[in-house]
Each structure stands twice: as structure tokens, then as C-alpha cells.
């Protein structure tokens, strides 16, 4: 199994993957296979109302760049100790003996995996080729972001040989064959999106290649600078009873997804008032309504908030509310 895989994002469309060769390989490592797939945002993000008081915005950070060649401060695997910056104590004889036993066990276990669990398989090289491996049940890796996870997993025992279905039916997962190095820059990715990356070491560069059990890491690309900005005009329609319907377009390709909109408006000479518009409410009304406005000139600005943070405020939109009998000064959603 490739060791200590770490992943970082250095741009909104790239993830850099680095790893170390297996400690006790079976034969010579001829190449590595790296597969990646986009991870869907948690479905609860689409349902929850992030305008509710006390509900914190979901924390989603991208995977920051390496601090140094060996730094794993932002990228600890599940198996690593996070005790801090202290130096390690000298090892005792019993610890050294224990490590030798573990190393021996790992070698034996990898031999077992090679000979018993895994069936040699054919793959064609190059990005975009079919992945004919046994389907694995996706593990929940929790919130991915500035922590990447290295998870060696054992595939289910396949009933058939090399013709099982890819992870998602009809989906050809992109992959890259890496020769003579322990790193890869994965490009052409979507901004502020989580990816699950699978890494295997292979020791036979033939159609019947033999590859290790996979190690997994997760990473998120960096946000795109203006992706959360509302483009196009904020329009308005004035209805009976001084109800003003404000409308705007959702950002086309936001960072992750838009969780809420902030509407900031004020009557000339008055203080600014705020309205929070959730995903669901925006979807229902294509904007929001201001109800029972007092007569006067108004200006409105709107900004979107995505998983990556706030977009920019729109340019102010102006409208005039005429005098209306029996109007309480209030806003409406």
C-alpha cells in the first residue's frame, strides 16, 4: 500500500497528491494508479435553513498547500499522531522488536491480499479509461477540507473475475498512471469541490497488472474568486399594499452551493435593514418580498453566501414606494 498519501489544493482547479512508496513492496513497483471522483455535497446542506438563528454556516475549507516537503500539519491521516511539534523519544528495545513484528505482519498480510483477495485485472492506461474493479461501498469520510484521510480498504471478495461494475453505473472515473515518481498534479477540477482520491501501487506493467489495496485521501479545491457574485440586475415589482418583490439570478457556478442570501435595504434617511433569504425560500419566490413599506425612496443590495463564504454585494437597486393608506413600516419575506 502506498504510504502517507497527502493531498493539497493550490488553485481552484488543481489538487496535488504526494505519497511515499510502500515500505515492503512485493517486487518492484512499476507504477501507481490514481483514480479520483467528485463528491456530492451533504444532502442536509440543501435542506437546512441557514438563516435560522443559532444555526452556524457549514464549515468547508479547501486543502491548503504544503507548508514544507514533509509537513502534514493540515493533512494528517487517521493513523497519524497529532501530538504537536515535540520530538520523538528514543525507542526502547521492546518497541523496536514490536515494530519488526508489525513490519513482518504487514508484509505477510500484503502477500495474502495479493494472492487470495485480489484478482489480477486488465486496465488500459491514460485518463478517462474504464475502471473495471469490484464496486466498493463508499465510506463516509466526514467533513473533508484541510484534513485528508488515508484509508487502506479491502475490497469485497469478488464473485466474478475482471468484469465487475464501476463505482457508479455508466460512469467512467478519470485516472492517471504515474511512473517513476511519487506525486501527481490532478488538473481540470471544479472549483471548491470535494474529491475522493484513490491510490494504488502496482508491480507488473502488463495487461494483467497486479496492484495493491487502495489508499484513499480526500481534498477540496480552492474557491473561485467571483463565483458567488450575483450577476445581472436585481429587478423589482411593486404590488398592492406596497409589497415589493425583489428578484435576482442565482450564481451559475457557485463555490459548492449557495446556502443563503442577505438582502440589505434602506429608505432614504433611515438606517439599513437586513433580511435573510434561505435556499428554499429563494427557490419558492425567485427572490423575496418586502411588505408594508413606508412611502419613500429605497435602495437595495444583495449578496450570496456559499460554502466558501460571502460573494460581493450587488450594485444598489433603487425603487420608490408611493403613499399608501394604513401601512405599518415593516419588511416581508
Amino acid at each position: 500500500v502506498p504510504l502517507d498519501p497527502i493531498s493539497v489544493s493550490n488553485s481552484s482547479s488543481q489538487i496535488i497528491l504526494k505519497w511515499k512508496p510502500p515500505s515492503d513492496p512485493n517486487g518492484n513497483i512499476t507504477h501507481y494508479l490514481v483514480f479520483w471522483e467528485r463528491q456530492a455535497e451533504d444532502s442536509e446542506l440543501f435542506e437546512l435553513d441557514y438563516c435560522l438563528k443559532g444555526l452556524k454556516l457549514p464549515s468547508r475549507t479547501w486543502s491548503p498547500p504544503f507548508e514544507s516537503e514533509d509537513s502534514q500539519k493540515h493533512n494528517q491521516s487517521e493513523y497519524e499522531d497529532s501530538a504537536g511539534e515535540c520530538c520523538s523519544c528514543p525507542k526502547t528495545d521492546s518497541q523496536i522488536l514490536k515494530e519488526l513484528e508489525e513490519s513482518s505482519f504487514r508484509k505477510t498480510f500484503e502477500d495474502y491480499l495479493h494472492n487470495v483477495v485480489f484478482v489480477p485485472r486488465k486496465t488500459s492506461s491514460g485518463t478517462g479509461a474504464e475502471d473495471p474493479r469490484p464496486s466498493r461501498k463508499r465510506r463516509s469520510l466526514g467533513d473533508v477540507g484541510n484534513v485528508t484521510v488515508a484509508v487502506p480498504t479491502v475490497a469485497a471478495f469478488p464473485n466474478t473475475s475482471s468484469t465487475s461494475v464501476p463505482t457508479s453505473p455508466e460512469e467512467h472515473r478519470p485516472f492517471e498512471k504515474v511512473v517513476n515518481k511519487e506525486s501527481l498534479v490532478i488538473s481540470g477540477l471544479r472549483h471548491f469541490t470535494g474529491y475522493r482520491i484513490e491510490l494504488q501501487a502496482c508491480n507488473q506493467d502488463t495487461p494483467e497488472e497486479r496492484c495493491s489495496v487502495a489508499a484513499y485521501v480526500s481534498a477540496r479545491t480552492m474557491p473561485e474568486a467571483k463565483a458567488d457574485d450575483i450577476v445581472g440586475p436585481v429587478t423589482h415589482e411593486i404590488f398592492e399594499n406596497n409589497v415589493v418583490h425583489l428578484m435576482w439570478q442565482e450564481p451559475k457556478e457557485p463555490n459548492g452551493l449557495i446556502v443563503l442570501y442577505e438582502v440589505s435595504y434602506r429608505r432614504y434617511g433611515d438606517e439599513e435593514l437586513h433580511l435573510c433569504v434561505s435556499r428554499k425560500h429563494f427557490a419558492l419566490e425567485r427572490g423575496c418580498r418586502l411588505r408594508g413599506l413606508s412611502p419613500g425612496n429605497y435602495s437595495v443590495r444583495i449578496r450570496a453566501t456559499s460554502l466558501a463564504g460571502n460573494g460581493s454585494w450587488t450594485e444598489p437597486t433603487y425603487f420608490y414606494v408611493t403613499d399608501y393608506l394604513d401601512v405599518p413600516s415593516n419588511i416581508a419575506k
Epitope: E237, H274, L275, A283, E285, R289, N330
Partner: antibody
């Protein structure tokens, strides 16, 4: 003047289907989300379903999920509720109502009665 | 779902006398932007409901100033300063802060 008129109610056997309609006039129908709210005999009000202004987003109460379908035809200014697999507990007066987010419903129809009985 | 509890469920009053209805929610109705979406509806026998009050204390147009809404957080009150014949029927509170919208069980205002 805003008007909402429901039709399509009646007596139906359990397990059967019924389709309610709500004709809207006096406002820009395509600008508003619309709801169905029901009231069982002698009971309180229960929200049933909502549909967005364009018809692309729909939400349902748990009690009707998978059995009822809300839809709309903006060209006809009409809201619909397709009710399948009806149960005795669906017996109620069904109202269509105009959505005002946060403020609930600013205009209601007169209601149409649905009775589910064998 | 947010549970709305009204009391009393039945309120016998004499014409010209005041009346008060209480509504309590299982969760705070204060939205993230500071607004509180608590509304009151009135339903006369055989008619559809009509909204009287929105956002705790704002009267809909055409609603007489005899009706006053108050409260905050989870506790709300609808007061009628002098009950008139037109007021009899059922009053419902409804919250519009949390999804889905939910109603109280209703308070029946009856002639004493």
C-alpha cells in the same frame, strides 16, 4: 381583486384518486408560490404542500408525501393537487392559498370538500 | 416540526369585553435576520381563514385596531380590546420561521 377558486372535491373510496384544481385571478399567478392547506371536520388547519412560482420546487407534509402531487400551469393560472391512495384521514376541506414567505398565506380560496369513505 | 400550543381552546366572552389568546411555540421564532414570523388568522364558521396579524404585531390592511398582537421568542398573545359580534369564530396562530409552517390548534371565541 385576488380570487382563488377550488374545484374537484367529492366523495371517494379509500385507495382511489382525486384531482383538485384552484383557478387564480386578480394577480400575477406566475410570480407567486402556492400552497394547499387542509382542515379535517371540526379540526385545525394543516399545511399540505407548496409549489414554487415556476413549478420546479415542491415540498410536502410527511403525512401526504409519496401520495399527493402538487403542480401548476402558469399559462392557465391554475394550481392542482393530485391525490392518490386516499385514506379516511385525508377527509377534509382543502384550501389553496397564496404564499407569502414568513407570513404564511395572504389569500385563501373558499375551499373544496374531500370525503374519503367506503 | 415546531409545535404551536394555544390556550385557552375555548374562550367565552361578553360583547364589548376584552379577550386574550395565548400562543406558545416549541422553538424560538426569531429568524437569523432578527425578524419573528408569528402570524394570527381568524376563521368564521363556514368561511376560509383570513390573516389578521403578521410578524407578531403588524395588522393586515382593513383589520381594526381593536386587534393587537404582542410577544417575543416563544410566547405570543393576541388581544381584542372590545369583542364585537364579527369576531366570533376560531383564531389560529401560525409560525413562518421554521419549515414546514405550523398552526396552533385554534381558540374558539364564543358568546357568553
Amino acid at each position: 381583486e385576488v380570487q382563488l377558486v377550488e374545484t374537484g372535491g367529492g366523495v371517494v373510496q379509500p385507495g382511489r384518486s382525486l384531482r383538485l384544481s384552484c383557478a387564480a385571478s386578480g394577480f400575477t399567478f406566475s410570480s407567486y408560490a402556492m400552497h394547499w392547506v387542509r382542515q379535517a371536520p371540526g379540526k385545525g388547519l394543516e399545511w399540505v404542500a407548496v409549489i414554487s412560482y415556476s413549478g420546479s420546487n415542491k415540498y410536502y407534509a410527511d403525512s401526504v408525501k409519496g401520495r399527493f402531487t402538487i403542480s401548476r400551469d402558469n399559462s392557465k393560472n391554475t394550481l392542482y393537487l393530485q391525490m392518490n391512495s386516499l385514506r379516511a384521514e385525508d377527509t377534509a376541506v382543502y384550501y389553496c392559498a397564496r404564499h407569502e414567505w414568513g407570513f404564511g398565506f395572504d389569500y385563501w380560496g373558499q375551499g373544496t370538500t374531500v370525503t374519503v369513505s367506503s | 416540526d415546531v409545535v404551536m400550543t394555544q390556550s385557552p381552546l375555548s374562550l367565552p366572552v361578553t360583547l364589548g369585553q376584552p379577550a386574550s389568546i395565548s400562543c406558545r411555540s416549541s422553538h424560538s421564532l426569531v429568524y437569523g435576520d432578527g425578524n419573528t414570523y408569528l402570524n394570527w388568522f381568524h376563521q368564521r364558521p363556514g368561511q376560509s381563514p383570513r390573516r389578521l396579524i403578521y410578524k407578531v404585531s403588524n395588522r393586515d390592511s382593513g383589520v381594526p385596531d381593536r386587534f393587537a398582537g404582542s410577544g417575543s421568542g416563544t410566547d405570543f398573545t393576541l388581544k381584542i380590546s372590545r369583542v364585537e359580534a364579527d369576531d366570533f369564530g376560531v383564531f389560529y396562530c401560525m409560525q413562518g420561521t421554521h419549515w414546514p409552517y405550523t398552526f396552533g390548534q385554534g381558540t374558539k371565541l364564543e358568546i357568553k
